[in-house]
């Protein structure tokens, strides 16, 4: 069907508790693409239909809330103008209550649910909660061995849960708990992490890192589309901007009229102990004037360039 | 909660400087997220003033950046808002609050600054 | 900059009545559509952060929704503590810019 596959990472989730997730594939979909949700290579689309217990919000498929039986291979097809590609998701559904005694037997248990907290400093830990904008989520409440979180030590800020003076006996098996309303029908949510603890410093220091790109040009054919990343390491859920610029301004300021030139949207992956950030910049169309300009990525006090050059002529098509 | 405690004279004279200091406990400015200045005229909307991140780099609302600069003191726990050659207009309510990844979520009590001759 | 526009910028209702403030970018914002609440004298305080989630304490009558620029902010059953200005701030863009407050008050 002139699909392109891509195989993504496993989610391993707990059952009886909504879940979501969002098909965004970056350069994909940040144009103009319709998304469709399948079931292990069901011809049948996922229902749309919201009263249905699992449907298609936009880009994302929801669960309220998920099953045991709910395992299994689910695609997205993000259809393009002149592209069309197959995102599969490998759901494995778990029965799990977090105030078991231990939190072993887990199998492959992804970052979110494994957090570290670091040793006599102020540190903070991380709700994750991914879910469309139709679903209202409850303040978060935060729990350690299944006792309601208190004390001046601890404050919760938005999803996080701040951890002042932290001590070893910090260590332990927490749980962040939301209400999630959705058409007026009430579910809960309950993440359980797993907390250890270290003496050493955090991931790489306070200043981002752009991978890509490295202050270089790039060869590129005159009124082509023409699309670049920018991925950038930082600590988790820092306050450092990550945008595209061009003779200082913002792209999407600088081309506000043409929008030959646009900046994406900013979508990140989380590891243990930072993210990893990933904007792009599109080229609808490279110009004559285009070529030679640094388009800067910037990230907080870091910055990083692309420049467009023609390619060397090649004398072999004459 | 995080507490903050913002500081400094009441009164300033047109022209010269505005400084307030913003206390921060429970919580150090080097660990994470942004501190930043609001401040809000008499009987009108709130205005952003700028941020001194956990890392130390600062951003200031293009507005009022060629006036303000923000500092800290991290043996203090302390961020600072200097605020130069004031006119009546700068009077308001100046708020001291952490940005966390989305808003601006604990503020401090705010400290009236009235710049008058 | 990104304005933010906020409507009614007053109102007066009843007890028990449903209350809605809508609050429309000038700009896409990507959700970081951010409530909060002040009452005279004191500093504000966040309701709603990222377009849909409450903040800690926030009782359940306060319901957000929107997307893309339009936002909306609904009180279902007005309160007599829920006298205060509301204001809305977009946190997508530099620099965070807030919308001109809405004043509710009780007939």
């Known amino acids: 069907d002139g699909c392109k596959d891509i195989f993504m990472k496993n989610e391993i989730l707990s059952a009886s508790q909504p879940f979501a997730f969002n098909c965004t594939f970056p350069p994909i979909t940040s144009g103009e693409v319709s998304v469709t949700w399948y079931k292990n290579s069901s011809k049948i689309p996922v229902s749309k239909i919201i009263q249905s217990r699992i449907h298609q919000d936009e880009t994302w498929i929801l669960f309220l809330p998920m099953e045991w039986g709910d395992s299994g291979v689910y695609q997205c097809v993000i259809k393009g103008r002149d592209s069309c590609h197959r995102i599969h998701v490998n759901l494995t559904v778990f029965e799990k209550h977090w105030c078991d005694t231990s939190i072993g037997g887990l199998p492959n248990l992804s970052d979110e649910y494994k957090q570290i907290l670091h040793l006599g400093k102020d540190d903070s830990l991380t709700c994750h909660l991914h879910f469309p904008k139709s679903c209202v989520l409850g303040p978060i409440k935060w729990y350690k061995d299944c006792n309601e979180i208190k004390g001046e030590r601890f404050t919760v800020l938005e999803t996080r849960l701040l951890v002042s003076n932290v001590s070893a006996e910090d260590r332990g098996n927490y749980a962040c708990q939301a209400i999630l309303t959705h058409s007026g029908k009430q579910y809960e949510v309950l993440n359980g992490i797993t907390v250890s603890i270290t003496e050493r410093a955090g991931y790489g220091g306070s200043v981002p890192k752009i991978i890509y790109p490295k202050n270089h040009s790039i060869e590129v054919q005159l009124g082509t589309t023409l699309i670049v990343d920018c991925n950038v390491t930082d600590t988790k859920d820092n306050t450092n901007l990550r945008c595209w610029r061009v003779n200082n301004t913002l792209v999407d300021d600088y081309y506000d009229e043409s929008k030959r030139i646009r900046e994406g949207v900013e979508t990140h992956v989380s590891f243990r102990e930072h993210n990893l950030y990933t904007v792009n910049i599109t080229f609808l169309e490279v110009k004559m004037e285009d070529y030679g300009l640094p388009f800067m990525c910037h990230a907080g006090v870091s910055t990083a360039y692309i420049i467009l050059q023609l390619p060397a002529p090649d004398f072999r098509a004459y | 909660d995080l507490q903050f405690q913002e500081s400094g004279p009441g009164l300033v004279k047109p022209s010269q400087t505005l400084s307030l200091t913003c206390t921060v406990s429970?919580?150090?400015?080097?660990?994470?997220?942004?501190w930043n200045w609001i401040r809000q005229p008499p009987g009108k909307g709130l205005e952003w003033i700028g941020y001194?991140?956990?890392?130390?780099?600062?951003n200031y609302n293009p507005s009022l950046k060629s006036r303000v600069t923000i500092t800290r003191d991290t043996s203090k726990n302390q961020f600072s808002l200097k605020l130069s050659s004031v006119t009546a207009a700068d009077t308001a309510v100046y708020f001291c609050?952490?940005?966390?990844?989305?808003?601006?979520?604990?503020w401090g009590q705010g400290t009236l600054v009235t710049v008058s001759s | 900059d990104i304005q933010m526009t906020q409507s009614p910028s007053s109102l007066s209702a009843s007890v028990g009545d449903r209350v809605t403030i809508t609050c429309r970018a000038s700009?896409?914002?990507?959700?970081?559509l951010n409530w909060y609440q002040q009452k005279p004298g004191k500093a504000p305080k966040l309701l709603i952060y990222?377009?849909?989630m409450l903040h800690s304490g926030v009782p359940s009558r306060f319901s957000p929704s929107g997307s893309g620029n339009d936002y909306t902010f609904t009180i279902s059953s007005l309160q007599p503590e829920d006298i205060a200005t509301y204001y809305c701030q977009q946190g997508h863009t530099l620099p965070w810019t807030f919308g001109g407050g809405t004043k509710v008050e009780i007939k």
């Open positions: 700009q896409w914002i990507n959700n970081y």
């Open positions: 990222y377009t849909s």
């Open positions: 001194i991140s956990y890392s130390g780099d600062t």
């Open positions: 429970r919580y150090s400015i080097t660990a994470d997220f942004a």
């Open positions: 609050a952490i940005r966390g990844p989305y808003s601006f979520t604990y």
